[in-house]
Amino acid sequence: VDKGFINIFPMINTTVFVNDGENVDLIVEYEAFPKPEHQQWIYMNRTFTDKWEDYPKSENESNIRYVSELHLTRLKGTEGGTYTFLVSNSDVNAAIAFNVYVNTKPEILTYDRLVNGMLQCVAAGFPEPTIDWYFCPGTEQRCSASVLPVDVQTLNSSGPPFGKLVVQSSIDSSAFKHNGTVECKAYNDVGKTSAYFNFAFKEQIHPH
């Protein structure tokens, strides 16, 4: 007697980049003989009970091709990760994994004046944000003179894999001889956010 088989074919790239708030349709076709008995989609060790459907490609008696679709709606930055489709029949098990990355606009997590006189800005987003610094004298918040950071680090995120990437950047405020405003601008392909520190007044954050 021939041994059974399952062959899975992804209908979308197995590495997927999706923007925050968008949908994505994870779709596979698979060949199974004998007929499939169990199918499931899993994310973070949790099984989806809805949002997916599984059906034969045709209604012919001899059909061995099937389709499974997982419809992810309004994905959040915290919902990136590995989504796995598993299918089994009486002879074999098979699986395919999709790595989903959610692109998110940077958010500035902290913006501090440290005791050593450094100004530090920490931002999170995906793809990894870039942090630029600008200074403008006086009280204007239209800063154009760029300032080179003293230190830039990519921090390990405490969140799950595929989550936002955290970047920390610092500048030395002792270089500024006048009162004024310092802008920390975090940006990536999705968008940008700025925080402003006024030497004479308390800090304030203005997302753009």
Partner: antibody, heavy 113, light 107 residues
Framework: EVQLLESGGGLVQPGGSLRLSCAAS????????MQWVRQAPGKGLEWVSG????????VYADSVKGRFTISRDNSKNTLYLQMNSLRAEDTAVYYC??????WGQGTLVTVSS | DIQMTQSPATLSLSPGERATLSCRAS??????LAWYQQKPGQAPRLLIY???NRATGIPARFSGSGSGTDFTLTISSLEPEDFAVYYC?????????FGQGTRLEIK
């Protein structure tokens, strides 16, 4: 801002061909199952065809099977519908849409001698 | 193919009233049901997806319910701009079918 812009409609004689295009912007086109839906004048909506994100699998309504071909070019963010052997009953506004609810404004196809 | 039947075909109500539109599938479509609104000369607009989830930007007066074969769209208090044609749509088992529509008109 999400936009789906259909083009390629027009007047064609029975038995003729047309190719519709749908240019997508404002969302990650390559992640979406796309579809064509049509609406005959004064009538309801009729699903025509669908295509998976990779373009590797397609499905058609019985009324157009063997005559219409759906395809996509993810590098150009564009969906296509090749319509052959057109009939009077194919006269309709053709919409491209995502499975998730984004729709274009439609392009009118008129099949008449 | 799964058939979708909407009722009533026409519903005549006044602004401020509650509207209840029904959609029945010829076989179970689980919760894979959407509701669309269409005004003359315009493309359909998604109101509800997966039977009960409001689409982005849709006012809270629109709500959906049901699963399996019987579904309902409720508009709690009609606004003048709500008078239009409403379609239900299923997307189960790879195919997609629409109901024939319910015309909501001003009484």
């Amino acid at each position: 801002e999400v936009q789906l812009l259909e083009s390629g409609g027009g007047l064609v004689q029975p038995g003729g061909s047309l190719r519709l295009s749908c240019a997508a912007s404002g969302f990650t086109f390559s992640n979406y199952l796309m579809q064509w839906v049509r609406q005959a004048p004064g009538k309801g909506l009729e699903w025509v065809s669908g295509i998976v994100p990779s373009g590797g699998s397609t499905v058609y309504a019985d009324s157009v099977k063997g005559r219409f071909t759906i395809s996509r070019d993810n590098s150009k963010n564009t969906l296509y519908l090749q319509m052959n052997s057109l009939r009077a009953e194919d006269t309709a506004v053709y919409y491209c849409a995502t499975r998730g609810g984004y729709w274009g404004q439609g392009t009118l196809v008129t099949v008449s001698s | 193919d799964i058939q979708m039947t909407q009722s009533p075909a026409t519903l005549s109500l006044s602004p401020g009233e509650r509207a209840t539109l029904s959609c029945r599938a010829s076989q179970s479509v689980s919760s894979y049901l959407a509701w669309y609104q269409q005004k003359p000369g315009q493309a359909p607009r998604l109101l509800i997806y997966d039977a009960s989830n409001r689409a982005t930007g849709i006012p809270a007066r629109f709500s959906g319910s049901g699963s399996g074969t019987d579904f309902t769209l409720t508009i709690s208090s009609l606004e003048p701009e709500d008078f239009a044609v409403y379609y239900c749509q299923q997307r189960s088992n790879g195919g997609i079918t629409f109901g024939q529509g319910t015309r909501l008109e001003i009484k």
